[in-house]
């Protein structure tokens, strides 16, 4: 990959192994766990990142596992099945043959079942709401400055097209970032909102996926923006199918 420079590293994904074994001896970076070659000029898919995270040997781990109190998607970390495009397979199963259906960001959207469970299609998550609470500051941030800084972050760091950042809401100390991306809107080469949200989530937790870059240093007009809580909500193009038992629990 040309994006992986002469020193043969992957700037956008530290969970890779890079080697000059590509065509013509060019640098090629493969995701840990899956072995799939990744494009180092853009974000790696969340599925491949999760698989890499679960496969990295303890002694070689470069990323910190979240503490027991960390908020994680639904059922937390699991070793996913990814398709040859690097997307989540619609049906995920664990080692004990318990299966469930997931959406395009890998979050469970049905009750758990057995191997007979069918997941006909990978349902797209088209709306992501990132809910942040920042640490106390002397005063509230200016809303338009905050809006501009977060939009810049998603555009420059995560390479997400600005049109997919639908809105930034702010009521001190809560910040909400809305990402929207329908199937019809996503063109070839566009970063997926699910991938951008995952990179952002890991950045916020101090577990940056970028190679060699410093951690995320968010500042609004020079004032540090320190996040103390993150919740991420996912809305799918087709509503999830959970039993009433779960809904009333």
């Amino acid at each position: 990959h040309t994006a992986a420079q002469d020193n043969c590293t992957c700037p956008t994904n530290k969970m890779t192994v890079c080697s000059p074994d590509g065509p013509g001896g060019r640098c090629q970076c493969r995701a840990l766990g899956s072995g799939m070659a990744v494009d180092c000029s853009t974000l790696t898919s969340k599925c491949l990142l999760l698989k890499a995270r679960m496969s990295a040997p303890k002694n070689a781990r470069t990323l910190v596992r979240p503490s027991e109190h960390a908020l994680v998607d639904n059922d937390g970390l699991y070793d996913p099945d990814c398709d040859p495009e690097g997307r989540f397979k619609a049906r995920q199963c664990n080692q004990t043959s318990v299966c469930w259906c997931v959406n395009s960001v890998g979050v469970r959207r049905t009750d758990k079942g057995d191997l007979s469970l069918r997941c006909d299609e990978l349902v797209r998550t088209h709306h992501i709401l990132i809910d942040l609470r920042h640490r106390p500051t002397a005063g509230a941030f200016n809303h338009s400055d905050l809006d501009a800084e977060l939009r810049r972050l998603f555009r420059e760091r995560y390479r997400l097209h600005p049109k997919f950042v639908a809105a930034v809401h702010y009521e001190q100390p809560t910040i909400q970032i809305e990402l929207r991306q329908n199937t019809s809107q996503k063109a070839a080469g566009d970063v997926d909102i699910g991938d951008a949200a995952y990179y952002f989530e890991r950045d916020i937790k101090g577990e940056s996926l970028f190679q060699g870059r410093g951690g995320l240093d968010l500042r609004v007009r020079g004032e540090p923006l320190q996040v103390e809580r993150t919740l991420i909500y996912y809305l799918d193009e087709i509503p999830p199918k959970f039993s009433m038992k779960r809904l009333t629990a």
Epitope: V17, S19, P20, D21, P23, G25, L32, S34, G35, P84
Partner: antibody
Framework: QVQLVQSGPEVKKPGASVKVSCKAS????????LGWVRQAPGQGLEWMGN????????NYNEKFKGKVTITADTSTSTAYMELSSLRSEDTAVYFC?????????WGQGTLVTVSS | DIVMTQSPDSLAVSLGERATINCKSS????????????LAWYQQKPGQPPKLLIY???TRESGVPDRFSGSGSGTDFTLTISSLQAEDVAVYYC?????????FGQGTKLEIK
């Protein structure tokens, strides 16, 4: 030039273990994936797993997990593939190979025979 | 796992004639990030290790005669020997190195008619 030289043939009894070596030369050992492939008599090729010696990352084919252990010694540019709890079905030629899009480099193969 | 299926299992072709071996994968081997097909073709003669002929579905390894060519994309691939020579008698394998575990086709035995 790139060369992978494997250890000689082995005859083992059922239940024993065997360790096959693969000495690499002619390239930077730590910069390339090195894989192991099995070929039972008259059969096809099966990928067993690989190792990236530079960072000791290892991948195993599920089929061989618990049966095979892949290691590498960077000081001698040598990779190893150990088979445990040998059975007659493990009788095969085992190849090491440098992996990659255009890495057509294979060891000569090591015949492991399991017989009582 | 990706399943690689070759056809035919065996093939007899006259010297100087064209030989065609097909390989079908159960999942696409095209990497959308770099538009590379992660498929290789190997030739194996008795008592020898496999020899790489083609990588990336269609790129000939250096030193391989130009009568060998590879084509195809996604899930369907073909190895063609344009004019069979006596030294081409061997077993031919396709291999996916797109995603772990890497898998091989069952092999095609090529003989002279």
């Amino acid at each position: 030039q790139v060369q992978l030289v494997q250890s000689g043939p082995e005859v083992k009894k059922p239940g024993a273990s065997v360790k096959v070596s693969c000495k690499a030369s002619g390239y930077t050992f730590t910069e390339y994936w090195l894989g192991w492939v099995r070929q039972a008599p008259g059969q096809g090729l099966e990928w067993m797993g690989n190792i990236f010696p530079g960072s000791a990352y290892i991948n195993y084919n599920e089929k061989f997990k618990g049966k095979v252990t892949i290691t590498a010694d960077t000081s001698t540019s040598t990779a190893y593939m150990e088979l445990s709890s040998l059975r007659s079905e493990d009788t095969a030629v085992y190849f090491c190979a440098r992996e990659g899009s255009n890495s057509g480099y294979w060891g000569q193969g090591t015949l492991v025979t399991v017989s009582s | 796992d990706i399943v690689m299926t070759q056809s035919p299992d065996s093939l007899a072709v006259s010297l100087g004639e064209r030989a065609t071996i097909n390989c079908k994968s159960s999942q696409s081997l095209l990497n959308s990030g770099n538009q590379q097909n992660y498929l290789a073709w190997y030739q194996q003669k008795p008592g020898q290790p496999p020899k790489l002929l083609i990588y990336g579905a269609s790129t000939r390894e250096s030193g391989v005669p130009d009568r060998f060519s590879g084509s195809g994309s996604g899930t369907d691939f073909t190895l063609t020997i344009s004019s069979l020579q006596a030294e081409d008698v061997a077993v031919y394998y396709c291999q996916s190195d797109h995603i772990y575990p890497y898998t091989f086709g069952q092999g095609t035995k090529l003989e002279i008619k």
